[in-house]
Interface confidence: low
Protein backbone atom coordinates (compact mmCIF):
# COMPACT_ATOMS: atom_id res chain seq x y z
CA UNK A 1 0.00 0.00 0.00
CA UNK A 2 0.97 3.66 -0.14
CA UNK A 3 4.01 4.60 1.95
CA UNK A 4 2.66 6.75 4.80
CA UNK A 5 4.86 9.72 3.90
CA UNK A 6 3.29 10.03 0.45
CA UNK A 7 0.43 12.54 0.47
CA UNK A 8 -2.37 11.44 -1.81
CA UNK A 9 -4.23 14.38 -3.31
CA UNK A 10 -6.79 15.12 -5.97
CA UNK A 11 -3.97 15.96 -8.36
CA UNK A 12 -1.71 12.96 -7.98
CA UNK A 13 -4.14 10.05 -7.85
CA UNK A 14 -2.97 7.46 -10.35
CA UNK A 15 -5.22 7.64 -13.41
CA UNK A 16 -6.56 4.15 -13.89
CA UNK A 17 -9.87 3.47 -15.57
CA UNK A 18 -12.34 0.64 -15.30
CA UNK A 19 -13.89 -1.21 -18.24
CA UNK A 20 -16.30 1.66 -18.84
CA UNK A 21 -13.52 4.24 -18.98
CA UNK A 22 -14.41 5.79 -15.62
CA UNK A 23 -11.57 6.82 -13.35
CA UNK A 24 -10.96 4.12 -10.74
CA UNK A 25 -9.71 5.24 -7.35
CA UNK A 26 -7.72 3.03 -5.00
CA UNK A 27 -9.83 0.89 -2.69
CA UNK A 28 -10.21 1.45 1.04
CA UNK A 29 -9.77 -1.80 2.95
CA UNK A 30 -9.28 -3.01 6.47
CA UNK A 31 -5.58 -3.78 6.74
CA UNK A 32 -4.46 -5.35 10.01
CA UNK A 33 -2.51 -8.26 8.53
CA UNK A 34 -2.94 -11.29 10.83
CA UNK A 35 -4.68 -10.87 14.19
CA UNK A 36 -6.08 -13.37 16.68
CA UNK A 37 -9.86 -13.59 16.41
CA UNK A 38 -12.84 -14.75 18.45
CA UNK A 39 -14.97 -15.18 15.33
CA UNK A 40 -16.27 -18.76 15.38
CA UNK A 41 -19.54 -20.51 14.53
CA UNK A 42 -21.18 -17.26 13.44
CA UNK A 43 -23.03 -16.28 10.28
CA UNK A 44 -20.92 -13.14 10.08
CA UNK A 45 -18.26 -11.30 12.04
CA UNK A 46 -16.79 -7.83 12.22
CA UNK A 47 -13.05 -7.72 11.67
CA UNK A 48 -12.33 -5.64 14.81
CA UNK A 49 -9.50 -4.15 12.75
CA UNK A 50 -8.92 -0.52 13.71
CA UNK A 51 -7.03 0.34 10.53
CA UNK A 52 -8.58 1.52 7.30
CA UNK A 53 -5.92 1.55 4.63
CA UNK A 54 -5.73 2.98 1.14
CA UNK A 55 -4.65 0.27 -1.22
CA UNK A 56 -1.48 1.02 -3.15
CA UNK A 57 -2.84 0.18 -6.59
CA UNK A 58 -6.30 1.06 -7.93
CA UNK A 59 -6.82 -2.51 -9.10
CA UNK A 60 -6.31 -3.99 -5.62
CA UNK A 61 -9.30 -5.32 -3.70
CA UNK A 62 -10.02 -6.13 -0.07
CA UNK A 63 -9.25 -9.63 1.21
CA UNK A 64 -10.03 -11.44 4.46
CA UNK A 65 -8.63 -14.82 5.46
CA UNK A 66 -10.08 -16.78 8.42
CA UNK A 67 -8.05 -19.70 9.72
CA UNK A 68 -8.70 -22.11 12.56
CA UNK A 69 -6.41 -24.82 13.87
CA UNK A 70 -6.03 -26.73 17.12
CA UNK A 71 -4.43 -23.75 18.84
CA UNK A 72 -6.15 -20.58 17.69
CA UNK A 73 -8.28 -18.65 15.24
CA UNK A 74 -6.84 -15.81 13.19
CA UNK A 75 -8.29 -13.26 10.82
CA UNK A 76 -6.13 -11.61 8.19
CA UNK A 77 -7.22 -8.39 6.48
CA UNK A 78 -5.24 -6.93 3.56
CA UNK A 79 -5.35 -5.31 0.13
CA UNK A 80 -4.34 -7.55 -2.77
CA UNK A 81 -4.19 -7.51 -6.56
CA UNK A 82 -6.77 -10.04 -7.83
CA UNK A 83 -4.58 -10.83 -10.82
CA UNK A 84 -2.18 -12.51 -8.40
CA UNK A 85 -2.91 -15.57 -6.24
CA UNK A 86 -3.13 -15.11 -2.48
CA UNK A 87 -2.21 -18.01 -0.21
CA UNK A 88 -2.00 -19.95 -3.50
CA UNK A 89 -5.64 -19.27 -4.32
CA UNK A 90 -7.17 -17.12 -7.04
CA UNK A 91 -9.46 -14.31 -5.84
CA UNK A 92 -12.44 -15.49 -7.84
CA UNK A 93 -14.98 -13.26 -6.03
CA UNK A 94 -12.98 -10.02 -6.26
CA UNK A 95 -15.80 -8.11 -7.97
CA UNK A 96 -18.28 -8.85 -5.16
CA UNK A 97 -19.37 -5.87 -3.04
CA UNK A 98 -19.51 -8.13 0.03
CA UNK A 99 -16.90 -10.43 1.56
CA UNK A 100 -18.56 -13.85 1.32
CA UNK A 101 -16.32 -16.47 2.89
CA UNK A 102 -15.58 -19.63 0.94
CA UNK A 103 -13.77 -22.63 2.33
CA UNK A 104 -10.45 -23.65 0.75
CA UNK A 105 -8.55 -26.87 1.20
CA UNK A 106 -5.55 -26.47 3.49
CA UNK A 107 -4.03 -29.38 5.41
CA UNK A 108 -4.16 -29.17 9.20
CA UNK A 109 -6.55 -26.26 9.44
CA UNK A 110 -9.92 -24.85 8.47
CA UNK A 111 -9.32 -22.10 5.93
CA UNK A 112 -11.84 -19.58 4.60
CA UNK A 113 -11.09 -16.69 2.27
CA UNK A 114 -13.09 -13.88 0.70
CA UNK A 115 -12.42 -10.84 -1.45
CA UNK A 116 -14.56 -7.87 -2.40
CA UNK A 117 -14.44 -4.50 -4.08
CA UNK A 118 -16.35 -1.93 -2.05
CA UNK A 119 -14.77 0.34 0.56
CA UNK A 120 -13.97 -1.44 3.83
CA UNK A 121 -15.93 -4.47 2.66
CA UNK A 122 -13.55 -6.85 4.45
CA UNK A 123 -14.67 -5.39 7.77
CA UNK A 124 -17.81 -7.53 7.71
CA UNK A 125 -17.01 -11.12 6.80
CA UNK A 126 -19.98 -13.29 5.91
CA UNK A 127 -20.08 -17.06 6.25
CA UNK A 128 -23.72 -17.36 5.23
CA UNK A 129 -24.78 -15.78 1.94
CA UNK A 130 -28.34 -15.15 3.06
CA UNK A 131 -27.11 -13.12 6.04
CA UNK A 132 -28.84 -9.73 6.23
CA UNK A 133 -26.25 -6.96 6.75
CA UNK A 134 -28.77 -4.33 7.81
CA UNK A 135 -28.18 -5.02 11.51
CA UNK A 136 -27.42 -1.55 12.94
CA UNK A 137 -24.73 -2.97 15.23
CA UNK A 138 -22.64 -3.62 12.15
CA UNK A 139 -22.35 0.12 11.59
CA UNK A 140 -20.37 0.64 14.77
CA UNK A 141 -17.15 0.13 12.90
CA UNK A 142 -13.82 0.52 14.61
CA UNK A 143 -11.51 2.81 12.72
CA UNK A 144 -9.78 6.19 12.75
Amino acid sequence: TIPPHVQKSVNNDMIVTDNNGAVKFPQLCKFCDVRFSTCDNQKSCMSNCSITSICEKPQEVCVAVWRKNDENITLETVCHDPKLPYHDFILEDAASPKCIMKEKKKPGETFFMCSCSSDECNDNIIFSEEYNTSNPDLLLVIFQ
Partner: antibody, heavy 121, light 107 residues
Framework: QVQLVESGGGLVQPGGSLRLSCAVS????????MSWVRQAPGKGLEWVSS????????HNTDSVKGRFSISRDNSKNTLYLQMNSLRAEDTAVYFC??????????????WGQGTLVTVSS | DIQMTQSPSSLSASVGDRVTITCRAS??????LNWYQQKPGKAPKLLIY???SLQSGVPSRFSGSGSGTDFTLTISSLQPEDFATYYC?????????FGQGTKVEIK
Protein backbone atom coordinates in the same frame (compact mmCIF):
# COMPACT_ATOMS: atom_id res chain seq x y z
CA GLN B 1 -0.97 22.53 0.59
CA VAL B 2 -3.04 20.53 3.07
CA GLN B 3 -5.23 22.68 5.30
CA LEU B 4 -7.84 21.94 7.97
CA VAL B 5 -9.62 24.97 9.40
CA GLU B 6 -12.06 24.60 12.30
CA SER B 7 -14.80 27.09 13.15
CA GLY B 8 -17.97 27.30 15.22
CA GLY B 9 -16.53 27.36 18.72
CA GLY B 10 -17.62 29.83 21.37
CA LEU B 11 -19.26 30.30 24.75
CA VAL B 12 -22.39 28.28 25.41
CA GLN B 13 -24.46 27.59 28.52
CA PRO B 14 -24.72 24.08 30.00
CA GLY B 15 -27.38 22.14 28.13
CA GLY B 16 -26.83 24.22 25.00
CA SER B 17 -25.71 23.23 21.52
CA LEU B 18 -22.95 24.11 19.08
CA ARG B 19 -21.99 22.91 15.62
CA LEU B 20 -18.32 22.81 14.75
CA SER B 21 -17.10 22.77 11.17
CA CYS B 22 -13.77 21.79 9.67
CA ALA B 23 -13.09 23.03 6.13
CA VAL B 24 -10.54 20.88 4.34
CA SER B 25 -8.38 21.58 1.30
CA UNK B 26 -5.28 20.15 -0.32
CA UNK B 27 -6.13 16.44 -0.34
CA UNK B 28 -8.81 14.05 -1.57
CA UNK B 29 -11.12 14.51 1.42
CA UNK B 30 -13.59 11.85 0.31
CA UNK B 31 -10.91 9.15 0.49
CA UNK B 32 -10.10 9.51 4.18
CA UNK B 33 -11.64 8.83 7.54
CA MET B 34 -11.69 11.99 9.68
CA SER B 35 -11.71 12.58 13.41
CA TRP B 36 -12.28 15.11 16.17
CA VAL B 37 -9.84 15.22 19.10
CA ARG B 38 -10.22 17.61 22.03
CA GLN B 39 -7.99 19.11 24.69
CA ALA B 40 -9.35 20.57 27.91
CA PRO B 41 -7.47 23.63 29.19
CA GLY B 42 -4.10 22.57 30.56
CA LYS B 43 -4.88 18.90 29.94
CA GLY B 44 -3.95 16.16 27.48
CA LEU B 45 -5.48 14.98 24.21
CA GLU B 46 -8.71 12.98 24.06
CA TRP B 47 -10.17 11.36 20.96
CA VAL B 48 -13.85 12.27 20.55
CA SER B 49 -15.28 10.94 17.33
CA SER B 50 -14.47 9.50 13.90
CA UNK B 51 -16.29 9.05 10.62
CA UNK B 52 -15.55 6.78 7.68
CA UNK B 53 -14.55 8.16 4.28
CA UNK B 54 -18.01 7.71 2.81
CA UNK B 55 -19.71 9.05 5.93
CA UNK B 56 -21.85 5.99 6.56
CA UNK B 57 -20.05 4.84 9.70
CA UNK B 58 -19.27 6.74 12.88
CA HIS B 59 -17.68 5.96 16.22
CA ASN B 60 -17.69 8.08 19.38
CA THR B 61 -16.03 8.04 22.76
CA ASP B 62 -18.35 6.87 25.52
CA SER B 63 -18.60 10.25 27.27
CA VAL B 64 -20.24 11.93 24.26
CA LYS B 65 -22.47 9.12 22.98
CA GLY B 66 -26.04 10.31 22.49
CA ARG B 67 -24.95 13.96 22.70
CA PHE B 68 -22.42 14.50 19.91
CA SER B 69 -22.84 13.58 16.27
CA ILE B 70 -20.09 13.61 13.64
CA SER B 71 -20.94 14.05 9.97
CA ARG B 72 -19.38 15.15 6.72
CA ASP B 73 -20.28 16.69 3.38
CA ASN B 74 -17.89 15.30 0.80
CA SER B 75 -19.20 17.69 -1.85
CA LYS B 76 -18.17 20.63 0.36
CA ASN B 77 -14.97 19.05 1.77
CA THR B 78 -16.28 19.77 5.25
CA LEU B 79 -16.38 17.80 8.49
CA TYR B 80 -18.91 18.62 11.24
CA LEU B 81 -19.42 17.95 14.92
CA GLN B 82 -22.92 18.63 16.26
CA MET B 83 -22.69 19.00 20.04
CA ASN B 84 -25.88 18.89 22.10
CA SER B 85 -26.58 18.81 25.86
CA LEU B 86 -23.20 20.39 26.47
CA ARG B 87 -21.60 20.05 29.90
CA ALA B 88 -18.87 21.99 31.68
CA GLU B 89 -16.52 19.05 31.17
CA ASP B 90 -16.87 19.45 27.39
CA THR B 91 -14.94 22.72 27.62
CA ALA B 92 -11.90 22.23 25.41
CA VAL B 93 -10.13 23.12 22.21
CA TYR B 94 -11.55 20.87 19.49
CA PHE B 95 -9.21 19.78 16.72
CA CYS B 96 -10.18 18.07 13.50
CA UNK B 97 -7.64 15.63 12.14
CA UNK B 98 -7.19 13.54 9.05
CA UNK B 99 -6.87 9.85 9.74
CA UNK B 100 -4.37 8.34 7.35
CA UNK B 101 -3.78 4.61 7.35
CA UNK B 102 -1.33 3.06 4.94
CA UNK B 103 0.64 -0.16 4.96
CA UNK B 104 -1.30 -1.16 8.05
CA UNK B 105 -0.09 1.86 10.02
CA UNK B 106 -2.44 4.45 11.49
CA UNK B 107 -2.14 7.95 12.91
CA UNK B 108 -3.69 11.44 13.03
CA UNK B 109 -2.02 13.78 10.55
CA UNK B 110 -2.36 16.62 9.88
CA TRP B 111 -4.43 18.54 12.42
CA GLY B 112 -6.38 21.79 12.24
CA GLN B 113 -5.48 24.73 14.46
CA GLY B 114 -8.42 24.03 16.80
CA THR B 115 -11.50 25.93 17.94
CA LEU B 116 -12.29 26.68 21.59
CA VAL B 117 -15.60 25.56 23.08
CA THR B 118 -16.41 27.00 26.53
CA VAL B 119 -19.41 25.65 28.43
CA SER B 120 -20.26 27.93 31.32
CA SER B 121 -23.21 29.70 32.89
CA ASP C 1 -9.83 0.85 26.86
CA ILE C 2 -6.06 0.69 26.58
CA GLN C 3 -4.35 3.02 29.07
CA MET C 4 -1.19 4.81 28.00
CA THR C 5 1.19 6.01 30.72
CA GLN C 6 4.06 8.37 29.98
CA SER C 7 7.07 9.11 32.13
CA PRO C 8 8.28 11.48 33.25
CA SER C 9 5.41 13.97 33.33
CA SER C 10 7.93 16.75 32.87
CA LEU C 11 11.66 17.14 32.56
CA SER C 12 14.19 19.95 32.38
CA ALA C 13 17.02 19.73 29.90
CA SER C 14 19.58 21.88 28.13
CA VAL C 15 20.20 22.42 24.44
CA GLY C 16 22.37 19.55 23.19
CA ASP C 17 21.14 17.07 25.80
CA ARG C 18 19.93 13.60 24.91
CA VAL C 19 16.31 13.27 26.05
CA THR C 20 14.34 10.04 26.50
CA ILE C 21 10.60 9.79 27.11
CA THR C 22 8.90 6.47 27.80
CA CYS C 23 5.36 5.31 27.15
CA ARG C 24 3.78 2.15 28.54
CA ALA C 25 0.57 0.53 27.31
CA SER C 26 -1.74 -1.36 29.64
CA UNK C 27 -1.72 -4.28 27.17
CA UNK C 28 0.31 -5.28 24.15
CA UNK C 29 -0.23 -2.98 21.17
CA UNK C 30 2.39 -4.51 18.88
CA UNK C 31 3.99 -1.51 17.13
CA UNK C 32 0.79 0.56 16.81
CA LEU C 33 2.25 3.53 18.67
CA ASN C 34 2.60 7.12 17.49
CA TRP C 35 4.36 10.16 18.95
CA TYR C 36 3.24 13.79 18.65
CA GLN C 37 4.81 17.12 19.57
CA GLN C 38 2.66 20.04 20.71
CA LYS C 39 3.72 23.60 21.38
CA PRO C 40 1.57 26.01 23.43
CA GLY C 41 -1.43 27.28 21.50
CA LYS C 42 -0.67 25.05 18.52
CA ALA C 43 -2.01 21.79 17.11
CA PRO C 44 -0.17 18.53 17.72
CA LYS C 45 2.33 17.48 15.05
CA LEU C 46 3.07 13.87 14.16
CA LEU C 47 6.71 12.91 14.76
CA ILE C 48 6.85 9.12 14.76
CA TYR C 49 4.32 6.53 13.60
CA UNK C 50 4.31 2.76 13.97
CA UNK C 51 6.70 3.02 16.96
CA UNK C 52 9.82 3.78 14.94
CA SER C 53 9.00 5.33 11.55
CA LEU C 54 9.99 8.97 11.19
CA GLN C 55 7.29 11.14 9.65
CA SER C 56 8.34 13.01 6.52
CA GLY C 57 9.92 16.37 7.32
CA VAL C 58 10.74 15.53 10.94
CA PRO C 59 14.42 15.98 11.89
CA SER C 60 16.44 12.79 12.27
CA ARG C 61 17.38 13.66 15.85
CA PHE C 62 13.95 12.24 16.76
CA SER C 63 13.70 8.47 16.96
CA GLY C 64 11.29 5.93 18.37
CA SER C 65 11.66 2.37 19.54
CA GLY C 66 9.81 -0.41 21.30
CA SER C 67 7.02 -2.89 20.74
CA GLY C 68 4.44 -4.70 22.82
CA THR C 69 3.90 -2.54 25.89
CA ASP C 70 7.06 -0.43 26.27
CA PHE C 71 8.06 2.40 23.94
CA THR C 72 10.62 5.18 23.88
CA LEU C 73 10.94 8.53 22.14
CA THR C 74 14.50 9.82 22.00
CA ILE C 75 15.78 13.26 21.01
CA SER C 76 19.48 12.73 20.38
CA SER C 77 20.52 16.38 20.72
CA LEU C 78 17.87 18.75 22.04
CA GLN C 79 17.38 21.93 20.02
CA PRO C 80 15.70 25.18 21.14
CA GLU C 81 12.63 24.44 19.00
CA ASP C 82 12.17 21.05 20.70
CA PHE C 83 10.90 22.49 23.98
CA ALA C 84 7.29 21.33 23.90
CA THR C 85 4.92 18.69 25.22
CA TYR C 86 5.12 15.19 23.74
CA TYR C 87 2.28 12.67 23.58
CA CYS C 88 2.19 8.98 22.73
CA UNK C 89 -0.96 7.46 21.19
CA UNK C 90 -1.96 3.87 20.53
CA UNK C 91 -3.82 2.98 17.34
CA UNK C 92 -4.13 -0.73 18.06
CA UNK C 93 -7.77 -0.55 19.08
CA UNK C 94 -10.64 1.88 19.47
CA UNK C 95 -10.86 4.16 21.29
CA UNK C 96 -7.46 5.48 20.26
CA UNK C 97 -5.93 6.71 23.50
CA PHE C 98 -3.15 9.14 24.35
CA GLY C 99 -0.61 9.32 27.12
CA GLN C 100 -0.97 12.21 29.55
CA GLY C 101 1.96 14.06 27.98
CA THR C 102 5.56 14.86 28.86
CA LYS C 103 6.56 18.52 29.05
CA VAL C 104 10.16 19.20 28.05
CA GLU C 105 11.31 22.48 29.61
CA ILE C 106 14.50 24.53 29.44
CA LYS C 107 16.85 23.93 32.35
Amino acid sequence: QVQLVESGGGLVQPGGSLRLSCAVSGFAFRRYAMSWVRQAPGKGLEWVSSISASGDRTHNTDSVKGRFSISRDNSKNTLYLQMNSLRAEDTAVYFCAKGLASSGKNYFDPWGQGTLVTVSS
Amino acid sequence: DIQMTQSPSSLSASVGDRVTITCRASQSISSYLNWYQQKPGKAPKLLIYAASSLQSGVPSRFSGSGSGTDFTLTISSLQPEDFATYYCQQSYSTPPTFGQGTKVEIK
